[in-house]
Amino acid sequence: LLVSQGVLLKCQKGSCSNATQYEDTGDLKVNNGTRRNISNKDLCASRSADQTVLCQSEWLKYQGKCYWFSNEMKSWSDSYVYCLERKSHLLIIHDQLEMAFIQKNLRQLNYVWIGLNFTSLKMTWTWVDGSPIDSKIFFIKGPAKENSCAAIKESKIFSETCSSVFKWICQY
């Protein structure tokens, strides 16, 4: 699954005021071969202004965002779709403070998928909102090639094969 097929999320100041801000993600290939069409407008539909956001049941709130930690395991692309279907997206980490919050709430020591994969088109690690990773802020250990997706474990970010099955984190 190449996230570079479309920009996933374009919310300004946490609101979804103007339909022209959204680009369609187009058809997303899912592992079982079915296809779904999900627009970015849908992703933003339930997101309030950052400071007044209300998180759904079982979601944790931090700095105006909501986080959901899975208990089951899926591949990166299945995790990606799971979050989209719940009007959210795989976790985008903006800074080390947010990373610390995630670590504090990860009860397990295993790998957990985040919304970051290596796009062979751009030859860079790219978040699911289309933005490239800032290597001054984040370091990823492991191969940087096609079918590389990022997972976190403890305080580290690892490159793993996208078809591996791990827990994951959704965010909106």
Partner: antibody, heavy 114, light 111 residues
Amino acid sequence: SLEESGGRLVKPDETLTITCTVSGIDLSSYIISWVRQAPGEGLEYIGFINTDGSAYYATWAKGRFTISRTSATVDLKMTSLTTEDTATYFCARDAGHRYLFYFKLWGQGTLVTV
Amino acid sequence: DIVMTQTPASVSAAAGGTVTINCQASQSISNELSWYQQKSGQPPKLLIYGASNLESGVPSRFKGSGSGTDFTLTISDLECADGATYYCQSNYYDSSSPDFAFGGGTEVVVK
């Protein structure tokens, strides 16, 4: 294998680029690090280039040293050289371990004299 | 930055004896430490990784131990060929940046 080249005698304040030529190594899977050793002194870590092409440096090396790569070479560019930069410069490849870093394969080094 | 402090700077022991080299990190680095042997005019050679894992082909006389901030390399049944300088290296990294500082080195002289 790894082979360093480009080391030579230079004057203070000059700029020099030395090269690590890799063979049989996929640079999208392994990091390449630069380490130096002044005559009779210990090993000093300079920095490395990650699998995605981003470079990381020891604090003391930031600004004056630049690591870059092509598909088969990793360069170390050194600016404003001083006599303290006189050393043998080694490149080393990490082991590609899933979790741990350690440097398994080393070049023979190239001598830079300022 | 992580600072690696290695002691002693030099140690002398008889063949067949044992030497112990200590390495202390300025902050906890878990088990993310490696040990190298370097002989004159040669590049370093990996001995131990992950604080206690013996690299393939390295004799079991070399033993690494420790975790957190304090680490030890023990060489038993010393042989003349063990005369060299030994370095510890932090291999610590997190989600922000790696720190691969070396210790100052310990010269081992086998009598």
